[in-house]
């Protein structure tokens, strides 16, 4: 079996000229293409993989919503030579991308990573955006997380930061077959520089805090290892959370998928694949049905086979 092969992070690797073909190994009987698109109120991007897969031919589409971050996952597996170029990897222009001045900022301010590499989305490096309310939803929280796509024996992951509806979520995630969007939320200006180690506290168990001594002369002691900051609107003394050392799980690692669920959906990402090719980076996926700009998605899309050449 011969399949197309590429790995796309955000805006490049499955771009038109960068397609490769690979011969699959023995026992590999399907070609795979999987696309995961993420849309924030300030833009959208996708990750995608094409290559040799395993499992059964079929399609799987899924729309997901994580606190106002919208994700759409598409998986297509097929058993003919070079059949895995049916999904539309082309990014549609986001409304209101480039027209955000038309929206009234709501006061929240977050770091934004939309299709940025991990190197460009570190700490306070990424651009800062003003949050605004969209489609009747209030976006006053900030998010720091990752989108991860695993297919054809390849895992691609990109950071995601931006404005969300929730201000307190901790290591929340939504998943599709081989696809995960997960992260944590926070409240306060530019609070989402690094929420990887944000600790989950049950609402019924109050967090352990250090109370400052009852004197105004000496500054309060801060926890040195805290990377999450709590901000309060009321003029009370700011306290730092002491994080249990056992709660260091990071949201950067992808979730394992339940393969039985995937099989029921009609396509599987399990198993190995013959060598993948291509390099990181292009596009956007078609498809979720939320927000006010539905019309910009061409559904499941299709290969852009040229109608004819010439000028």
């Amino acid at each position: 079996l011969e399949c197309y092969s590429c790995v796309q992070k955000a805006d490049d690797g499955c771009s038109p000229h960068r397609m490769k073909t690979v011969k699959c190994g023995p026992g590999v009987d399907v070609c795979t293409e999987a696309v995961g698109a993420v849309e924030t109120i300030h833009g959208q991007f996708s990750v995608a993989v094409r290559g040799c897969g395993s499992g059964i031919p079929g399609k799987n589409d899924r729309g997901l919503d994580l606190h106002g971050l919208l994700a759409f996952f598409q998986l297509q597996q097929c058993s003919e030579d070079r059949c895995n170029a049916k999904l539309n990897l082309t990014l549609r222009g986001l409304n209101p991308a480039g027209n955000e001045s038309a929206y009234e900022p709501n006061g929240a301010e977050c770091y934004s990573c939309v299709g940025l590499s991990r190197e460009k989305c570190q700490g306070s490096m990424p651009p800062v955006v003003n949050c605004y309310n969209a489609s009747g939803r209030v976006y006053k929280g900030c998010f720091d997380g990752n989108v991860t796509l695993t297919a054809a024996n390849v895992t691609v992951s990109l950071p995601v930061r931006g404005c969300v509806q929730d201000e307190t979520c901790t290591r929340d995630g939504v998943t599709g077959p081989g696809f995960t969007l997960s992260g944590s939320c926070c409240q306060g200006p530019r609070c989402n520089a690094d929420l990887r180690n944000k600790t989950y506290f049950s609402p019924r168990i109050p967090p352990l805090v250090l109370l400052p001594p009852p004197t105004t002369a000496a500054p309060s002691t801060r926890a040195q290892n805290s990377s999450s900051t709590t901000s309060t609107a009321a003029p009370t003394t700011t306290t730092s959370i002491i994080k249990p050392t056992t709660a260091q799980a990071s949201h950067t690692s992808p979730h394992e998928m339940d393969l039985e669920v995937i099989q029921e959906e009609g396509a599987s990402l399990s198993g190995g694949a013959a060598g993948h090719g291509g390099t990181a980076g292009h596009g956007g996926a078609a498809g979720h049905q939320d927000r006010s700009n539905m019309e910009k998605y061409p559904g499941k899309g299709g290969a852009q086979i040229p109608a004819k050449g010439g000028s």
Partner: antibody, heavy 117, light 112 residues
């Protein structure tokens, strides 16, 4: 029908600047990767620059890196090539080309840039 | 010097079969990247002739076919016609140059 119409070419002195435009119609421009490809008189095709649909990924040929800037305005369905520090060897017909399925499936008619003193 | 190597010229008589070769390296064709062929008639813009190694856009006659093997590709034209007289270019992505590269072009002359 897909149409790509280049403009902005002309005669310029070495060291000078020109800005080429390519007006696109007949397809969803904001979906398409676009490129500039040039052809010196009597010579072969040479790829110049490449821009993704959103404009966030850009590539340049080594021969123009640092001198040429590709950009696009999806609201105007227009592709641009800003050419600075022009040299005699930049003299060519400049084509704008659309990326289809892994190939340049549509080309403009080209605009001639002549760099001479 | 083009990254992809093509013979500068080729010729044939009407009805004949002509093949044009395109030789690359491990950073382009040999890396698995698909090959495309363009036809440029005199005084006109290039036109896509073959994409993805061996696929024809609609409107291109089946007299034109493409193939690829290892670090090389070839374009075959059977039943040669006078209107096939043109320059033919191969193209593929190149990892080293991080962009698409073209062959130097082959000028096809239809004799007689």
């Amino acid at each position: 029908e897909v149409q790509l119409l280049e403009s902005g070419g002309g005669l310029v002195q070495p060291g000078g600047s020109l800005r080429l435009s390519c007006a696109a119609s007949g397809f969803t421009f904001s979906n398409a990767w676009m490129s500039w490809v040039r052809q010196a008189p009597g010579k072969g095709l040479e790829w110049v620059s490449y821009i993704s649909s959103s404009g966030s990924t850009i590539y340049y040929a080594d021969s123009v890196k640092g001198r040429f800037t590709i950009s696009r305005d999806n609201s105007k369905n227009t592709l641009y090539l800003q050419m600075n520090s022009l040299r005699a060897e930049d003299t060519a017909v400049y084509y704008c080309a659309r990326e289809g399925l892994w190939a340049f499936d549509w080309w403009g008619q080209g605009t001639l840039v002549t760099v001479t003193s | 010097q083009s990254v992809l190597t093509q013979p500068p010229s080729a010729s044939g008589t009407p009805g004949q079969r002509v093949t044009i070769s395109c030789t690359g390296s491990s950073s382009n064709i040999g890396a698995g990247y698909v090959v495309h062929w363009y036809q440029q008639l005199p005084g006109t813009a290039p036109k896509l002739l073959i994409y993805d190694n061996n696929k024809r856009p609609s409107g291109v006659p089946d007299r034109f076919s493409g193939s690829k093997s290892g670090t090389s590709a070839s374009l075959a034209i059977s039943g040669l016609r006078s209107e096939d007289e043109a320059d033919y270019y191969c193209a593929a992505w190149d990892d080293r140059l991080n962009g698409p590269v073209f062959g130097g072009g082959t000028k096809l002359t239809v004799l007689g």
